[in-house]
Structures are given as structure tokens and as C-alpha cells.
Amino acid sequence: KAMHVAQPAVVLASSRGIASFVCEYASPGKATEVRVTVLRQADSQVTEVCAATYMMGNELTFLDDSICTGTSSGNQVNLTIQGLRAMDTGLYICKVELMYPPPYYLGIGNGTQIYVIDPEPCPDSD
């Protein structure tokens, strides 16, 4: 009955500080409403990065000020996190909750290590 969530082990953010990864879950039930949360784990502290609830077949809607965007297709969610800096390097965990109809199910991935490298400033041209 437990829900399995799969996500890539490692992702390298682009030079513009954008990282994308797929979060896939094996649904044990016929959920119509799903909540996806991205958590960041650093030094055993877990914080919420962003979250969205969506109806199956509809698009994910994150809050306007969220650093996350995403699309869904079946039991797969494509997540994009933007505005990342080198200090944001860390483990990003995909958490999936099947909210409705009951029963509720929780699934937590093993995390994606996102590496962010700040771009080198362009040298001054003479």
C-alpha cells in the first residue's frame, strides 16, 4: 500500500540558476487531487521550497511568488526551480500526497542533489 516516489539522484543547474527534474510516483489509489511539495534538506534540517495542489489532468499551479513551476502528465510531475545560487546547492526532496478521494497516501523520494555553480563574471573588455 505504500507509495513509491522516484526522482533523479543528481541534477546540475544551468548557468542561469535553473534546475529541472522529473518526480514520478506509483499511485496505489485512484486519486483525483494530488499535492506535490519540494523540500530542501540541509544539515538534517528540512524546509519547504514550494508546493502545489492539482487535479489529475490539470496543470500544477504554484503561488505567484514561488520559485517553482511545473507540469504534470499522469503520475509524473516535471518540476523546475529557478533563481538558484551556489549557496542553494543541496538535496531537494519530492513529496507527493494523494489528497482526494480518501484514503490519503504519502510518498517521499530519496531526493535530488542539485548542484549550482555561480557563473563567473565576464571579464572587463579593453
Partner: antibody, heavy 122, light 107 residues
Framework: EVQLVESGGGLVKELLGPGGSLRLSCAAS????????MNWVRQAPGKGLEWVSS????????YYADSVKGRFTISRDNAKNSLYLQMNSLRAEDTAVYYC???????????WGQGTMVTVSS | NEVLTQSPGTLSLSPGERATLSCRAS??????LGWYQQKPGQAPRLLIY???TRATGIPDRFSGSGSGTDFTLTITRLEPEDFAVYYC?????????FGQGTKVEIK
């Protein structure tokens, strides 16, 4: 300091016909209450823990144990940082200490209140 | 509903000894399992989540292991304050369920 404080427990007489009612409250402080799902868990005297009800952060999703479905109603007021449990048609078997508990980001119940005693006597 | 069975019901040990508590699920709960400690007259306290991750502020003498249906809580060297009742809980699906508890008492 992260804290949950329950109140509203007491003695209720189980009458012939529909039982009595009681409303429990749980005041939260020290964290962003509106970001967390919350639960009620109870413990009958000398017994183990039994989950009663759960409510999502925005009250959109609510779940009940079969033993209380149709009799108990969970609710919350994020503006007041408060969680509630309205208990109707109380029975002797509802006698227990009632705890409110926060659902941590990783799923377990990470913060608990000290509990409030509800006694239903015939 | 997921049924969690804890064993033994009571464990009689002396301070300094090792305690091994078991929790068995009726079907797989993956690693969505937590352990709680409860002392008389107090609320439960989260010790372990995700089967093996210690909660904030929990001493390293407490450790958890297992996945699927069989889980273990180990207390390496019992301190006087560790004598209490321990509950396991699955939180992977509703209804959320607890084991019946294991009492660790002073021998």
C-alpha cells in the same frame, strides 16, 4: 518555542438517547500554523494511541477514523492559530486524553500538545 | 487498515543495557514509520521518522532500522530517563495507525 496547548476537556454525562457534546481547542504558537496539517489523537486510560482526525493546512482535506465519523468534526482557524474538535453524541468509549499533534514536513507527528482529558460517564 | 504489532509487550532491563524493540506491519509501509516515546502523564515525543532518521534533539543512543514490514528501535545503553512506553506509527496512508506499545521497565 514551538507549542501546542489543548483545552476544553471535561466530564460529560452520557444520557439515554443522543450523548452529550464537547468542543476541544488547541492553541498553536512558535511556528507558522497555516503551513501545517494538524491531527487529533486520543488515548483511553491505560491504553495505546488512537488517531482520531486530520485536517490539511487550508482545511481543504479532512479525514476521520471510522470510530468517530459522523459524530466528530475537525476544523481550524488559521487567523487565530487554533485547531478544534467538535464532539457530538459522546459515548463512554470516547473517554480519553485528547492530544493535538502537528504533521511534520516529512510526515510523522512531530509536535504534540500536553493533552486534555474527556470523560464520558453514564 | 494497516495493523502494527509491537513486541515484546514489556521489556525488563537494567540501566546500561541494550533494548531492542520490534514493530511489524500487516503490509508494507515502506519507510513511512515513526517511533515515539511516552512517559507517564506526558505527551508522546517523536524519536525516529523515516524508519531510521533521528528527530531533532534525540540522543544518538536511539537508532531505528528496517523497511517494508519489519522495523526495530534500538537503545544502545539505557539511561534512567529512557524507561517509558514506546509506540511505532505508520504515516504512509490513512487511517494513521499506531502499535499497541512496548513498555521498557527497570528490572
Amino acid at each position: 518555542e514551538v507549542q501546542l496547548v489543548e483545552s476544553g476537556g471535561g466530564l460529560v454525562k452520557e444520557l439515554l438517547g443522543p450523548g452529550g457534546s464537547l468542543r476541544l481547542s488547541c492553541a498553536a504558537s512558535g511556528f507558522t500554523f497555516s503551513s501545517y496539517s494538524m491531527n487529533w489523537v486520543r488515548q483511553a486510560p491505560g491504553k495505546g494511541l488512537e488517531w482520531v482526525s486530520s485536517i490539511s493546512s487550508s482545511s481543504s482535506y479532512i479525514y476521520y477514523a471510522d470510530s468517530v465519523k459522523g459524530r466528530f468534526t475537525i476544523s481550524r482557524d488559521n487567523a487565530k492559530n487554533s485547531l478544534y474538535l467538535q464532539m457530538n453524541s459522546l459515548r463512554a468509549e470516547d473517554t480519553a486524553v485528547y492530544y493535538c499533534a502537528r504533521v511534520g514536513l516529512m510526515g510523522p507527528f512531530d509536535i504534540w500538545g500536553q493533552g486534555t482529558m474527556v470523560t464520558v460517564s453514564s | 487498515n494497516e495493523v502494527l504489532t509491537q513486541s515484546p509487550g514489556t521489556l525488563s532491563l537494567s540501566p546500561g543495557e541494550r533494548a531492542t524493540l520490534s514493530c511489524r506491519a500487516s503490509q508494507s509501509v515502506s519507510r513511512y514509520l515513526g517511533w515515539y516515546q511516552q512517559k507517564p502523564g506526558q505527551a508522546p515525543r517523536l524519536l525516529i521518522y523515516g524508519a531510521s532518521t533521528r528527530a531533532t534533539g534525540i540522543p544518538d543512543r536511539f537508532s531505528g532500522s528496517g523497511s517494508g514490514t519489519d522495523f526495530t528501535l534500538t537503545i544502545t545503553r539505557l539511561e534512567p530517563e529512557d524507561f517509558a512506553v514506546y509506540y511505532c506509527q505508520q504515516y504512509g496512508s490513512s487511517p494513521w495507525t499506531f502499535g499497541q506499545g512496548t513498555k521498557v521497565e527497570i528490572k
